[in-house]
């Protein structure tokens, strides 16, 4: 591991290198000071690769509630409401940090986890494979 | 708050109710078991509504690098490679959960924290505020 | 303190629709879930459905599609809940309720006073 | 849909007694919520993940039960715990309510 600069208010661990367990405040301190008002909230329905939104829950992790997008058509849509197959809806996907209860039940013990969760759809030219 | 069902196997905590500070292990596990080839990895480039990534790094935060997506276009562009300003390219934008060290520079205490990040972006159809 | 805020008794016509709202304050709107909740005049309680204030997703209980249609506005703070088609089955007191999304052990903790829908010609 | 069968319908209990009702589920669940609710007043919630008190429940309340067999005790029965109580899952959509146990005091 890395040592990282130590700040002498710092709470104690046995291993002075990088902790494999750490100790995390779950008060969560949330940066974005705004509310955006431009903000994803409706671009599900307004975009030309419209999603639906899933909502997945799992009480062993946290956040236990997450809401995850699954496109709705194979293309997109055109101005005319139509679906144009020509092109394609596909998921924009992200990795993303959750806690897992670790062991299970567990309130205070957690296992970081990185998980892969789709957040909307986006409109993409199909890649065409030529046959000689 | 509400006690959550305790597994005996669970380290102590001093609170039996909700903790506010909890341990963490780490060593992330990987619930994503294979890597999908499908992954958004080319989309930024072949979607209707384009992207950059720009990389936002921070020594204080767990992950310390976050790639940031930025529209290319205010348009989408078209069939032909031309921009179509009848339509708006849009972030998707997901608030996700990232570990801060907590007090600074402490290598085994953090505290949670929500972040806004683009992943991606999508074309809508603009809303037209019609004048009366 | 956490305060959901509903709007007052409703009396409407068969046919018609109404729009119920829960006003949130003293938490993090985005962290919670609105859920709503329906109580018959025999005092059965029914979930209606679900909004995400953060992504703008809902989720029905079949019974209610169609009927129900659930939304939410981060700037106001505020959810809603239209009633369409309205019948004397829809007579009821429409509870929203909040559900922490990051550890669901808390079951829905707040609830609002309730909205008395009563239909009548 | 799961549905929730709460028996008996209606009791009553003199102070000092102790009170069980049960909560019957057609399927399997993980956890149960239990909420309490007064004339012309919310529901409010009163014992969460089957057995977890919420804040300022009286510990004379307990929750108990694994897979379709659930209940709610109170210890010793007090005047202020005369209300209807509803047991509720949110293992499977959609979540539903049981019908309610109306808890008198005699």
């Known amino acids: 591991g890395i040592a990282i600069p130590r700040n002498s208010g710092c709470p104690n661990s046995e291993d002075k290198n990088f902790p494999r367990t750490v100790m995390v405040n779950l008060n969560i301190h949330n940066r974005n000071t705004s509310t955006n008002p431009k903000r994803s909230s409706d671009y599900y329905n307004r975009s030309t690769s419209p999603w639906n939104l899933h909502r997945n829950e799992d009480p062993e992790r946290y956040p236990s509630v997450i809401w995850e997008a699954k496109c709705r058509h194979l293309g997109c849509v055109k101005a005319d409401g139509n679906v144009d197959y020509h092109m394609n809806s596909v998921p924009i996907q992200q990795e993303i940090l959750v806690l897992r209860r670790e062991p299970r039940h567990c309130p205070n013990s957690f296992r970081l986890e990185k998980i892969l969760v789709s957040v909307g759809c986006t409109c993409v030219t199909p890649i065409v494979h030529h046959v000689a | 708050g509400i006690a959550i069902p305790r597994n005996s196997g669970c380290p102590n905590s001093e609170d039996k109710n909700f903790p506010r500070t909890v341990m963490v292990n780490l060593n992330i596990h990987n619930r994503n078991t294979s890597t999908n080839p499908k992954r958004s990895s080319d989309y930024y480039n072949r979607s209707t509504s384009p992207w950059n990534l720009h990389r936002n790094e921070d020594p204080e935060r767990y992950p310390s690098v976050i790639w940031e997506a930025k529209c290319r276009h205010l348009g989408c562009v078209k069939a032909d490679g031309n921009v179509d300003y009848h339509m708006n390219s849009v972030p998707i934008q997901q608030e996700i959960l990232v570990l801060r060290r907590e007090p600074r520079h402490c290598p085994n205490s953090f505290r949670l924290e929500k972040i806004l990040v683009s992943v991606g972006c999508t074309c809508v159809t603009p809303i037209v505020h019609h004048v009366a | 303190q956490v305060q959901l805020q509903q709007s007052g008794a409703e009396l409407v016509r068969p046919g018609t629709s109404v729009t119920l709202s829960c006003k949130a304050s003293?938490?993090?709107?985005?962290?919670?879930?609105i859920h709503w909740i329906k109580q018959t005049p025999a005092q059965v309680l029914e979930w209606i459905g679900v909004t995400d204030p953060e992504s703008g997703g809902t989720l029905h209980n079949p019974k209610f599609d169609g009927k129900a249609t659930l939304t939410a506005d981060k700037s106001s703070r505020t959810a809603y809940m239209e009633l369409r088609s309205l019948t004397s089955e829809d007579s009821a007191v429409y509870y929203c309720?909040?559900?922490?999304?990051?550890?669901?052990?808390?079951?829905?903790?707040?609830w609002g006073q309730g909205t008395s829908v009563t239909v009548s010609s | 849909q799961i549905v929730l069968t709460q028996s008996p319908a209606i009791m009553s209990a003199f102070p000092g007694e102790k009170v069980t009702m049960t909560c019957s589920a057609s399927?399997?669940?993980?956890?149960m919520c239990w909420y309490q609710q007064k004339p012309g007043t919310s529901p409010k919630r009163w014992i969460c993940?089957?057995?977890k008190l919420a804040s300022g429940v009286p510990v004379r309340f307990s929750g108990s039960g694994s897979g379709t067999s659930y209940s709610l005790t109170i210890n010793s029965m007090e005047t202020e715990d005369a209300a209807t109580y509803y047991c509720?899952?949110?293992?499977?959509?959609?979540?539903?309510f049981g019908g309610g146990t109306k808890v008198e005091i005699k």
């Open positions: 399927s399997s669940i993980s956890y």
């Open positions: 993940d089957t057995s």
């Open positions: 003293g938490y993090r709107f985005t962290d919670y879930e």
């Open positions: 509720q899952q949110r293992s499977s959509y959609p979540w539903t």
């Open positions: 309720t909040r559900y922490y999304k990051y550890e669901s052990f808390y079951g829905m903790d707040y």
